[in-house]
């Protein structure tokens, strides 16, 4: 398991909400991405492919999420001070092998200016 701080802007604030960006390498084909708040799993997204190369995307802990070819974004709404915490992107790479787990994260600071409005997408 590789641990580290995100070397990119992990938190993107929108009106009253935050987009948490979890990146993965372009070469990764199949994976599980979990968003952890402290040690608790808040959200997850798993992408796999079948024998016909058909993609399956699953969430056991569902959050509003967005998948691109090198990132998963998880969206948290209605921010308040209780959201301030360490957040981690826990990436399990299934394909290509070998199986690998990486953990990157950062601290989400909540300021009054970010609590002004309710986010609508």
């Amino acid at each position: 398991e590789i641990n580290g701080s995100a070397n990119y802007e992990m938190f993107i604030f929108h009106n009253g909400g935050v987009q948490i960006l979890c990146k993965y390498p372009d070469i990764v084909q199949q994976f599980k991405m979990q968003l952890l708040k402290g040690g608790q799993i808040l959200c997850d997204l798993t992408k796999t492919k079948g024998s016909g190369n058909t993609v399956s995307i699953k969430s056991l802990k569902f959050c509003h999420s967005q998948l691109s070819n090198n990132s998963v974004s998880f969206f948290l709404y209605n921010l308040d001070h209780s959201h301030a915490n360490y957040y981690f992107c826990n990436l399990s790479i299934f394909d290509p092998p070998p199986f690998k787990v990486t953990l990157t994260g950062g601290y989400l600071h909540i300021y009054e200016s970010q609590l002004c409005c309710q986010l609508k997408f």
Partner: antibody, heavy 117, light 111 residues
Framework: EVQLVESGGGLVQPGGSLRLSCAAS????????MDWVRQAPGKGLVWVSN????????EYSPFVKGRFTISRDNAKNTLYLQMNSLRAEDTAVYYC??????????WGQGTLVTVSS | DIVMTQSPDSLAVSLGERATINCKSS??????????LTWYQQKPGQPPKLLIF???TRHTGVPDRFSGSGSGTDFTLTISSLQAEDVAVYYC?????????FGPGTKVDIK
Amino acid sequence: EVQLVESGGGLVQPGGSLRLSCAASGFTFSDYWMDWVRQAPGKGLVWVSNIDEDGSITEYSPFVKGRFTISRDNAKNTLYLQMNSLRAEDTAVYYCTRWGRFGFDSWGQGTLVTVSS
Amino acid sequence: DIVMTQSPDSLAVSLGERATINCKSSQSLLSGSFNYLTWYQQKPGQPPKLLIFYASTRHTGVPDRFSGSGSGTDFTLTISSLQAEDVAVYYCHHHYNAPPTFGPGTKVDIK
């Protein structure tokens, strides 16, 4: 150790039905796509069908589409193949296989289906 | 559907000699960095066994005398020094799209 054990094969008349089962153990069944692959006596391998981790995606070979139905019960760690309107050309050993992300990495021993009058 | 062909249909090789099996697909299996091509070995009376995936990566526990090469539409499985236990039928298989298909197989025997 991954184990896949097929059952339910046998002799059936043309137009008849059979339900194959595959009991899986030694891995987290609900984390994997699963497939059926068949092999006619003395012939090569032919893919039949697959199903994703929770059963929401299924795909079929053109040879069996509309006649066969793949399903799974993750609580019982079991894969199924319901075969209807069977034909003589469906006679084969049917293998249950685990799609291990980039290949069929585990196979059962197979169950023989014979369609004959 | 993508059609997979193999050559030769069968070959006999002396123990310790090199065996080469060719596989051709009717369209390219290359997507991004990956060739969606696998090789399987089936010994008499047994189910198949995964040998090589992504055209050239050996599966866990596969001896290094087995190697895969090629890209696009032309692929090769090589057994560098044939052993008695390598007597089997070898199949190539694509998972580029649905339906995945297998080649007809190549039978390898001892000369």
